[in-house]
């Protein structure tokens, strides 16, 4: 991150260029890759963050059973198209004119096609299941203490309204955090569960997007909670459309 002036930065997004050219000389920050102005008092959308990541210099980078429609982001990183609000465009294409439809968290939800592929709407991911495995500890964490710590994390660090953290499940060493947010529930100004999940994923990988204090300090009754594996499942309001050959 290089800011136009040393005293002008974006605390919630390292992947920005900032300068004091906003109203009244206020700091204005733009996302790398897209040049879109971002609000540094809240999370930046996942689409803009992925775009910034692709434009940055490359460097080395009681449990729920997810149902048959759950998506995992197996495709990895790509350079997405974002709309003016920073949301993923429903149709994404690569440089070789291969196209596919994505959900609101940018995960592919159809087979890949050509430029004739139509994606009528951006389908909302309304349920996210974050599956974690923690490093071995002397004993299991107290479930209610663990629940409180993770709910506090999402409320404080990501500013996600507590009502969107549906549940925290625990069977040592597996922790599952369920986030739920229907279109009708999300009010103006509410942090999107997809953005919160992405920031959390980067945090637990030691790739925090925040400046200043930076990394996570998760503790349950003083005992460090260290995550060694993360898997995230995404469930959409409309089930994905894949051909049968993908399922075999």
């Amino acid at each position: 991150h290089t800011a136009a002036q040393d005293n002008c930065t974006c605390p919630t997004n390292k992947m920005t260029v900032c300068s004091p050219d906003g109203p009244g000389g206020r700091c204005q920050c733009r996302a790398l890759g897209s040049g879109v102005a971002v609000d540094c008092s809240t999370l930046t959308s996942k689409c803009l963050l992925l775009k910034a990541r692709m434009s940055a210099p490359k460097n080395a980078r009681t449990l729920v059973r997810p149902n048959e429609h759950a998506l995992v982001d197996n495709d990895g990183l790509y350079d997405p198209d974002c709309d003016p609000e920073g949301r993923f465009k429903a149709r994404q294409c690569n440089q070789t004119s291969v196209c596919w439809c994505v959900n609101s968290v940018g995960v592919r939800r159809t087979d890949k096609g050509d430029l004739s592929l139509r994606c009528d709407e951006l389908v909302r991911t309304h349920h996210i299941l974050i599956d974690l495995r923690h490093r071995p500890t002397a004993g299991a964490f107290n479930h209610s203490d663990l629940d409180a710590e993770l709910r506090r994390l999402f409320r404080e660090r990501y500013r996600l309204h507590p009502k969107f953290v549906a549940a925290v499940h625990y069977e040592q060493p597996t922790i599952q955090i369920e986030l739920r947010q229907n279109t009708s529930q999300k009010a103006a100004g509410d942090v999107d569960i997809g953005d919160a999940a992405y920031y959390f994923e980067r945090d637990v990988k030691g790739e925090s997007l925040f400046q200043g204090r930076g990394g996570l300090d998760l503790r349950v009754r003083g005992e460090p909670l260290q995550v060694e594996r993360t898997l995230i499942y995404y469930l959409d309001e409309i089930p994905p459309k894949f051909s049968m050959k993908r399922l075999t």
Partner: antibody, heavy 126, light 107 residues
Framework: AVTLDESGGGLQTPGGGLSLVCKAS????????MFWVRQAPGKGLEWVGV????????NYAPAVKGRATISRDNGQSTLRLQLNNLRAEDTGTYYC???????????????????WGHGTEVIVSS | ALALTQPSSVSANPGETVKITCSGG???YGWYQQKSPGSAPVTVI????KRPSNIPSRFSGSLSGSTNTLIITGVQAEDEAVYFC????????????FGAGTTLTVL
């Protein structure tokens, strides 16, 4: 009730060092970030520094950076401020304060203080 | 370094609504009441709009953009004090900061 009780103030000599202690009670000390804030006579409040709940992170105001060390003992529910190479401008009342947002990306903010100690007065003079 | 901007003084009659603004920081603002120099500050609002349980409900906080407002609805004589706002300096260093204080006079 939340209680924060500072001690260790008094008359100090320029160039010397001081050690202030804050004893906390009435809450789970291990769950909170802690701050030191000071106020020079007739002046406003000045943020001195912060320590996170585990003690693994500290941050200091430019005016004291390199001279100040904040530490904590969670077992004893105590917070400490060590300030070396004292100057006349270090004179003032020093307050221990509790932070209400340990996970916040801006957790160092003075806006998260939800409880204060009564303060201990420090005078740096020869 | 960033500076928090607040008015140096405001005055009001008992029963009136007082609004004191603080701008220049990011989202984590607080308001601290000090009735006399050297006496311990009292938190009236922290984290933009949260009120400690011992603070009367006439005190409230509101965040709009990067400006936080302390609102005292139906100000009383005992509310006369200096009010400091606290916030966050997002310049490298990322430290806490305070405004210079606003003296509230109840006429």
């Amino acid at each position: 009730a939340v209680t924060l009780d500072e001690s260790g103030g008094g008359l100090q000599t320029p160039g010397g060092g001081l050690s202030l202690v804050c004893k906390a009670s009435g809450f789970d000390f291990i769950d909170y970030d802690m701050f030191w804030v000071r106020q020079a006579p007739g002046k406003g409040l000045e943020w001195v520094g912060v320590i996170n709940r585990s003690g693994s992170y500290t941050n200091y105001a430019p005016a004291v950076k390199g001279r100040a060390t904040i530490s904590r003992d969670n077992g004893q529910s105590t917070l400490r401020l060590q300030l070396n190479n004292l100057r006349a401008e270090d004179t003032g009342t020093y307050y221990c304060a509790r932070g209400a947002c340990t996970h916040c990306w801006d957790a160092d903010s003075a806006g998260y203080i939800d409880a204060w100690g009564h303060g201990t007065e420090v005078i740096v003079s020869s | 370094a960033l500076a928090l901007t607040q008015p140096s003084s405001v005055s009001a009659n008992p029963g009136e609504t007082v609004k004191i603004t603080c701008s220049g920081g990011y989202s984590g603002y607080g308001w601290y009441q000090q009735k006399s120099p050297g006496s311990a500050p009292v938190t009236v609002i922290y984290w933009n709009d949260k009120r400690p349980s011992n603070i009367p409900s006439r005190f409230s906080g509101s965040l709009s953009g990067s400006t936080n407002t302390l609102i005292i609805t139906g100000v009383q004589a005992e509310d006369e004090a200096v009010y400091f706002c606290g916030g966050y300096d997002s310049s490298p260093g990322y430290v806490g900061i305070f405004g210079a204080g606003t003296t509230l006079t109840v006429l």
